[in-house]
Interface confidence: low
């Protein structure tokens, strides 16, 4: 019968001919009366056999990631009679893995959006690298993830590639972050290969800023001839938030005379001071009112940022008009 051991050839071998093993018949007494033949895909081009001894060699560099096994057939013939000594037999040459592929992040570029002020531990995104090496061959394809850039705001779980928030972030200070993740094979041992990817993390706005008046005092004038409903000037607050979170409402906080009103222009986010009752220079030539401003939408959990509304003082001078 046929005698052989399991055949393995390491990939990427640079030797011009690499001895893999020997195929032989147990009837072969070593007097060169038998001839061995190799058949099948790769026979003669990738693999050769010593016709006398049955020794098999690889004559080409192999890449396991391209092809991991070869199925060949062997024959042994008695040279004197030309007859087969053994029935033709099929055998396998396995290409064994070396760590020649670095981990690759196939889904990049990665982007994620996370609300600002999210608590520690909030999941941002999961990055996944793949390694073309053999996962069953030692640690060649066993990966560990680490953070090269992004501390102290982010952390990565070493075995899963899950990125989490590790420190609260304020969009108003910085609205995007570059996080660089490294994946290393061989679970970080010597000879490890690595790959990196960038993750763009964009902070979405939450309503963590209240509107604040630009000025603590506004001076406006109104003619005593102005009819009720007249716009006598505008006041303005600023809000570091954006979009809906920066929409605001102005209102009167203090006006003993009940002469004025404030309406909000939701396009410009300005407060328009309106005359509610006619004024008379001879009766009162100046007024002092206090206005306040609040955000339009404030979720319950963000009320802590909006405890005390910003206020401003408005001095209104009445202009005299000659009366008949």
């Amino acid at each position: 019968g046929w005698v052989w051991n399991q055949f393995f050839v390491p990939e990427e071998m640079n030797t011009t001919s690499h001895h893999i093993g020997q195929l032989r018949s147990d009837l072969d007494n070593g007097n060169n009366s038998f001839q061995y033949k190799l058949l099948g895909a790769g026979a003669g081009s990738t693999f050769i056999i010593d016709e006398r001894t049955g020794d098999i060699y690889a004559i080409q560099k192999l890449d396991r990631e391209e092809r991991s096994l070869y199925i060949l057939r062997a024959q042994v013939i008695d040279i004197a009679t030309g007859r087969a000594v053994e029935p033709e037999s099929e055998f396998v040459i396995k290409v064994s893995d070396i760590n020649d592929n670095e981990p690759k992040f196939l889904d990049e570029p990665y982007e994620a959006i996370v609300p600002e002020m999210s608590p520690e531990g909030t999941l941002v995104i999961q990055v996944t690298a793949s390694d073309a090496d053999d996962p069953s061959s030692g640690n060649n394809a066993r990966l560990l993830y680490s953070l090269l850039q992004g501390q102290p705001y982010f952390s990565v779980e070493p075995t899963t590639g899950v990125i989490r928030i590790s420190s609260k972030m304020d969009r108003e200070l910085q609205d995007e972050y570059w996080v660089i993740i490294q994946a290393k094979d061989m679970i970080g041992q010597p000879g490890a290969l690595s790959g990196t990817t960038s993750v763009l993390i964009k902070l979405s706005d939450v309503n963590d800023n209240k509107p604040i008046f630009k000025e603590s005092l506004y001076r406006l004038t109104v003619s005593e001839s102005a009819p009720t409903g007249t716009s006598i000037g505008t006041i303005m607050a600023y809000d570091n938030d954006i979009g809906e979170n920066a929409e605001m409402d102005y209102s009167i906080e203090e006006d003993d005379s009940q002469t004025f009103d404030i309406i909000t222009n939701h396009e410009t986010q300005e407060g328009i001071v309106i005359l509610k009752k006619k004024v008379d220079f001879e009766h009162q030539n100046h007024y002092g009112i206090r206005a306040k401003v609040k955000n339009h939408h404030v979720p319950e959990q963000l009320m802590k940022y909006h405890t005390e509304a910003s206020t401003t003082f408005i001095k209104i001078q009445v202009e005299d008009v000659d009366e008949p």
């Epitope: 570029p109 982007e111 995007e176 763009l200 954006i242």
Partner: antibody
Framework: QVQLVQSGAEVKKPGASVKVSCKAS????????MSWVRQAPGQGLEWMGI????????TYAQKFQGRVTMTGDTSTSTVYMELSSLRSEDTAVYYC?????????????WGQGTLVTVSS | QSVLTQPPSASGTPGQRVTISCSGS????????VNWYQQLPGTAPKLLIY???QRPSGVPDRFSGSKSGTSASLAISGLQSEDEADYYC???????????FGGGTKLTVLS
């Protein structure tokens, strides 16, 4: 490698409409936005609008609102851009460009361009 | 009149470093990622830099992008004759709810 192949050059009279196609291949068509950008002779690039092929959601530049229609056919992985009421200043090369999975992500692949000439 | 402002032209000699600027506002560059496109004569634009400073595969590391506040810039070091092209910045504008391009910069490589 992603491929975007556009339909051939067109010559149109003022007042007519033109429909340009862009056939996508070698990627998941329904996952990415597709924009249309035009370039008049000797001029810069001008964004016209964007479509998400899976739901057909569109956003058009203010300038083209009411004149442009973008559609997608998922069965053939093709997007179309139709521009109506053509005038001579619409003479330009029209490009389709693949966007990202988000509206605000870059255009990474471009079609070869389709020259539309508007002349009486 | 483009929403993003670029110089109409720039030039340099081979080996030099050239920078092209792109100026915008809070609603575009200030809020989103800047991308740069290269358009060689008679060809479709090609993505050169994305998300402010990332290079697609195949783009030499001579090209780099940066962003600060409401401005961005493209730097080309070790200028080569094949870099002669039009360069455009582009960004999504939150106010306009659409994409905006710079007017383009024609780069000339002087021999």
């Amino acid at each position: 490698q992603v491929q975007l192949v556009q339909s051939g050059a067109e010559v149109k009279k003022p007042g007519a409409s033109v429909k340009v196609s862009c056939k996508a291949s070698r990627y998941t068509f329904t996952s990415y936005y597709m924009s249309w950008v035009r370039q008049a002779p000797g001029q810069g690039l001008e964004w016209m609008g964007i479509i998400h092929p899976s739901g057909g959601d569109t956003t058009y530049a203010q300038k083209f609102q009411g004149r442009v229609t973008m559609t997608g056919d998922t069965s053939t992985s093709t997007v179309y851009m139709e521009l109506s009421s053509l005038r001579s200043e619409d003479t330009a090369v029209y490009y389709c460009a693949r966007g990202g999975i988000k509206l605000w992500l870059h255009f990474d692949y471009w079609g070869q361009g389709t020259l539309v000439t508007v002349s009486s | 009149q483009s929403v993003l402002t670029q110089p109409p032209s720039a030039s340099g000699t081979p080996g030099q470093r050239v920078t092209i600027s792109c100026s915008g506002s809070r609603s575009n560059i200030g809020s989103n990622f800047v991308n740069w496109y290269q358009q060689l004569p008679g060809t479709a634009p090609k993505l050169l830099i994305y998300t402010n400073n990332q290079r697609p595969s195949g783009v030499p590391d001579r090209f780099s992008g940066s962003k600060s506040g409401t401005s961005a810039s493209l730097a080309i070091s070790g200028l080569q004759s094949e870099d002669e092209a039009d360069y455009y910045c582009a960004v999504y504008d939150e106010s306009l709810q659409g994409w905006v391009f710079g007017g383009g910069t024609k780069l000339t490589v002087l021999s």
